[in-house]
Interface confidence: low
């Protein structure tokens, strides 16, 4: 039975040109995390494998940094980075847990005024 839950940073906004940390945390389970995948829609951004370490997809190498922890840092943000991001935790014996984060990248002036994107 899957007892765990994924806590995420939820819906977040950031400035164009800036950086943001995507964080997920798996709690309420003693399952062993064997691998975490970070995906944007259907694109693989990065993998953190318990035995092999980090892999960043070649197309994101310049703008994505591993960590902190099992999180992911996105740099040099563009408006095109707006969208859904998923952390996929592969665990034993529970199976797969998925967390969702929505990022909106705003023009600098808008972000400065504290505008936030909300999903109803």
């Amino acid at each position: 039975m899957m007892t765990g839950t994924i806590e995420t940073t939820g819906n977040i906004s950031a400035e164009k040109g800036g950086s943001i940390i995507l964080q997920c945390h798996l709690s309420s389970t003693t399952a062993q995390v064997t691998q975490v995948n970070w995906e944007q829609q259907d694109q693989l951004l990065a993998i953190c494998n318990a035995d092999l370490g980090w892999h960043i997809s070649p197309s994101f190498k310049d703008r994505v940094a591993p960590g902190p922890g099992l999180g992911l840092t996105l740099q040099s943000l563009t408006v095109n980075d707006t969208g859904e991001y998923f952390c996929i935790y592969h665990t034993y014996p529970d199976g797969t847990y998925t967390g969702r984060i929505f990022l909106e990248v705003l023009e600098s002036s808008v972000a400065e005024h504290g505008a936030r994107f909300q999903i109803p």
Epitope: Q32, T34, Q35, I47, N49, A50, L52, G53, Y92
Partner: antibody
Framework: QVQLVQSGAEVKKPGSSVKVSCKAS????????ISWVRQAPGQGLEWMGS????????NYAQKFQGRVTITADESTSTAYMELSSLRSEDTAVYYC??????????????????WGQGTLVTVSS | DIVMTQSPLSLPVTPGEPASISCRSS???????????LDWYLQKPGQSPQLLIY???NRASGVPDRFSGSGSGTDFTLKISRVEAEDVGVYYC?????????FGGGTKVEIK
């Protein structure tokens, strides 16, 4: 259906090098471990090393360290095994084999399936 | 390095009868993720090896259900419930728990 096709037989002189290729078709090349295993005539199987193209770095058996280089070209889905300073004891059939093909919780050199058809390398003066 | 010891070295079998091969490792093959990193391969005469069982007890795709793998830690067994003529060849166990990956010496199965 994943298939591995290896390059043809080679005859080499002692002290020279050989480079065997292994072309993968089907499945996800980047996230699959490609391993090299050799079998001397009438003998058992011996692991030489493995690479996961996704992670780039290869692991080698201590016995072959410094003599073997395993690389992968993701543009052609081809892995290579180069063995240098050849001696007669290196006469063997060299197999490439593939690990789990998907980026799921178990990733690595966990099992080998499928295997290439094998490449006979004969070292003789 | 982890040493893999197979027995017997040779196994003459009668078609229709069961057969069993043992494989022992010098260290535990149980990973913290709960899986035993132990595989079984069959190399038929003149062919490349083929995967039979992975992670201790999982039958590979297309492998007949007369083959089964069991065991945990350091002791593993491959069983063939009813041997068929096409099962002849050399059977190898392999550990993938630690680098370097190592194979057992092989068990040659032949028809009596």
């Amino acid at each position: 259906q994943v298939q591995l096709v290896q390059s043809g037989a080679e005859v080499k002189k002692p002290g020279s090098s050989v480079k065997v290729s292994c072309k993968a078709s089907g499945g996800t090349f980047l996230s699959s471990a490609i391993s090299w295993v050799r079998q001397a005539p009438g003998q058992g199987l011996e692991w030489m090393g493995s690479i996961i193209p996704l992670f780039g770095k290869a692991n080698y058996a201590q016995k072959f360290q410094g003599r073997v280089t395993i690389t992968a070209d993701e543009s052609t889905s081809t892995a290579y095994m180069e063995l240098s300073s050849l001696r007669s004891e290196d006469t063997a059939v060299y197999y490439c084999a593939r690990g789990p093909s998907e980026v799921k919780g178990i990733l690595g050199y966990v099992w080998f399936d499928p295997w290439g058809q094998g490449t006979l390398v004969t070292v003789s003066s | 390095d982890i040493v893999m010891t197979q027995s017997p070295l040779s196994l003459p079998v009668t078609p229709g009868e069961p057969a069993s091969i043992s494989c022992r490792s010098s260290q535990s093959l149980l990973h913290s993720n709960g899986y035993n990193y132990l595989d079984w391969y069959l190399q038929k005469p003149g062919q490349s090896p083929q995967l039979l069982i992975y992670l201790g007890s999982n039958r590979a795709s297309g492998v007949p259900d007369r083959f089964s793998g069991s065991g945990s830690g350091t002791d593993f067994t491959l069983k063939i419930s009813r041997v068929e003529a096409e099962d002849v060849g050399v059977y190898y166990c392999m550990q993938a728990r630690r680098i370097p990956i190592t194979f057992g010496g092989g068990t040659k199965v032949e028809i009596k």
